[in-house]
Interface confidence: low
Amino acid sequence: IWELKKDVYVVELDWYPDAPGEMVVLTCDTPEEDGITWTLDQSSEVLGSGKTLTIQVKEFGDAGQYTCHKGGEVLSHSLLLLHKKEDGIWSTDILKDQKEPKNKTFLRCEAKNYSGRFTCWWLTTISTDLTFSVKSSRGSSDPQGVTCGAATLSAERVRGDNKEYEYSVECQEDSACPAAEESLPIEVMVDAVHKLKYENYTSSFFIRDIIKPDPPKNLQLKPLKNSRQVEVSWEYPDTWSTPHSYFSLTFCVQVQGKSKREKKDRVFTDKTSATVICRKNASISVRAQDRYYSSSWSEWASVPCS
Amino acid sequence: RAVPGGSSPAWTQCQQLSQKLCTLAWSAHPLVGHMDLREEGDEETTNDVPHIQCGDGCDPQGLRDNSQFCLQRIHQGLIFYEKLLGSDIFTGEPSLLPDSPVAQLHASLLGLSQLLQPEGHHWETQQIPSLSPSQPWQRLLLRFKILRSLQAFVAVAARVFAHGAATLSP
């Protein structure tokens, strides 16, 4: 058993048929010694008396808010949550496996630049009685500070018969060094509580591996005289790290016909312009990637050819 | 500008070669073994690999003030990785093809380090670990980790040289 926050405790249980459970001793936070009784949740049934209560926690029916009273007055509460371990593996019932980039990916994180700011998100099908708390640090043995905001519901989607809820959180490294080569990973820890079930999820990454620039901005076409060719130009996204002579991007320019089956023409360039042939009804798209480190490409920025 | 008494590197040549290094480091990566060892996690296991750190002056401001600190750090790292790529870790079984990107990477690391330190100019280099000949599982694991770490190192070096070529070239 360990304390998650004031008056909230997590009991770690090996979860298998006829498991013995954990013996837990609760102590009433009071100077009083006599006449103390204990109840669970809204029930008025007295579970025991005295300053301490010893219980055997085996299942969710044994978890909940234990309250000690004296003469009708509430003295203190202890909320017990359960953390299940089945076959040596902690349960992951609350969050959905996003399966990208690999199985057992519950948290996904992205950064738009090297400033030390990043966003993480996760999915669940649970709509109520759900709370999240996020902590982060750089390294784990001698952790350096990362400040995370509160997790918020960022999207709702319908997937077949189910509703899926996306939560996200923004974090900022306290003393980021954008130009340095990271040697210690960022650690993100999410505590999830659904009713009386506690679970925790972690992710470990280098900012360089989660970089995904915003799409190029101000994408423009300029027809070239007496030619089917056009000059495509664009700019670095505003959110990208500066100076651009240091934090450089590379770009992919694609000409795509109306039909998905039509052959795509692709050009790769480090410049912020390119000359391509504009076919009728086609569109031109440009995306960006860090020039020196193969992290994710940005989403496409597109303009029609006509 | 470089410090008085310190010479400026051939920024443009360094830029071209460091960008080539980035490409090679990424093309070599899938060839390190038949397994994706990212499962190992990039835990804090980087004790003996040189990193370009915050105080090394490799940021745009530090380069403007005195690029020599940063260039020395990059040179140390290049020599370190060049030695590792020439060691039993990469030459032993399971053997890589002679024309693999690892061989080109090895040659390019040497080339860039020589551009940074012409004859007769000596910076002290970091001690290279001496590893006994190792087994395939050890080599495959180390190849993967070393190349992952090299990708990050050469990315910072390439940024330094790109910025230098754009803003510090005579």
Epitope: - | E40, T45, T46, N47, E93, S132, Q135, P136, Q138, L142
Partner: antibody
Framework: QVELVQSGAEVKKPGSSVKVSCKAS????????ISWVRQAPGQGLEWMGG????????NYAQKFQGRVTITADESTSTAYMELSSLRSEDTAVYYC??????????WGQGTLVTVSS | DIVLTQSPATLSLSPGERATLSCRAS???????LAWYQQKPGQAPRLLIY???SRATGVPARFSGSGSGTDFTLTISSLEPEDFAVYYC?????????FGQGTKVEIK
């Protein structure tokens, strides 16, 4: 002459963890790998994983992935193997061995871990 | 993972006789990275042969290893009383190293 000395026998409850140590003396600890091999009573040898102390890099057998953690402390020339969520079938003698190109040439004396409720 | 199958499971011989132990791999062992170990009751294994045929330091000449690819053999030319033990083959030519199940050489 390299010698590997392991920690003493352990008795553990199901669901708990055990951490076995392996201290090297008489050689350069960092220059080779340390592997961990276990042997259940009356059974054969089973490789669990290994570590290269100089780099701290570990490699684990698929069967133990997620349950075993192998670490090394260069300052004390000691390697550690921690096995979590113990079950009765983890009762075995656990050996550390110096793992070089010539196979496992130096072995610890073994540590008996008994898992029983 | 490469599976190593040792045969026979038990070999009953008398001192002075020749012992031939076989180890077959489910796929070719890279670089013939195959070792043989001897284990006596209550003791840690001892390395005898590495690289399929090289004798480890201090191992008597009566022990020899041969074979390549998927078929390997440990031969004890003339059994001494101290040679009665369990013998394991071990491949270390892949990212996941594996052992055979062992052959027990017992006194007939």
């Amino acid at each position: 002459q390299v010698e590997l000395v392991q920690s003493g026998a352990e008795v553990k409850k199901p669901g708990s963890s055990v951490k076995v140590s392996c201290k090297a003396s008489g050689g350069t600890f960092s220059n080779y790998a340390i592997s961990w091999v276990r042997q259940a009573p009356g059974q054969g040898l089973e490789w669990m994983g290994g570590i290269i102390p100089m780099f701290g890099y570990a490699n684990y057998a698929q069967k133990f992935q997620g349950r075993v953690t192998i670490t090394a402390d260069e300052s004390t020339s000691t390697a550690y193997m921690e096995l979590s969520s113990l079950r009765s079938e983890d009762t075995a003698v656990y050996y550390c061995a110096r793992d070089i190109y010539a196979g496992m040439d130096v072995w610890g004396q073994g540590t008996l871990v008994t898992v029983s409720s | 993972d490469i599976v190593l199958t040792q045969s026979p499971a038990t070999l009953s011989l008398s001192p002075g006789e020749r012992a031939t132990l076989s180890c077959r791999a489910s796929q070719s062992v890279l670089g013939n990275y195959l070792a043989w170990y001897q284990q006596k009751p209550g003791q840690a294994p001892r390395l005898l042969i590495y690289g399929a045929s090289s004798r480890a330091t201090g191992v008597p000449a009566r022990f020899s290893g041969s074979g390549s690819g998927t078929d390997f053999t440990l031969t004890i030319s003339s059994l001494e009383p101290e040679d009665f033990a369990v013998y394991y083959c071990h491949q270390y030519g892949s990212i996941s190293t594996t052992f055979g199940q062992g052959t027990k050489v017992e006194i007939k």
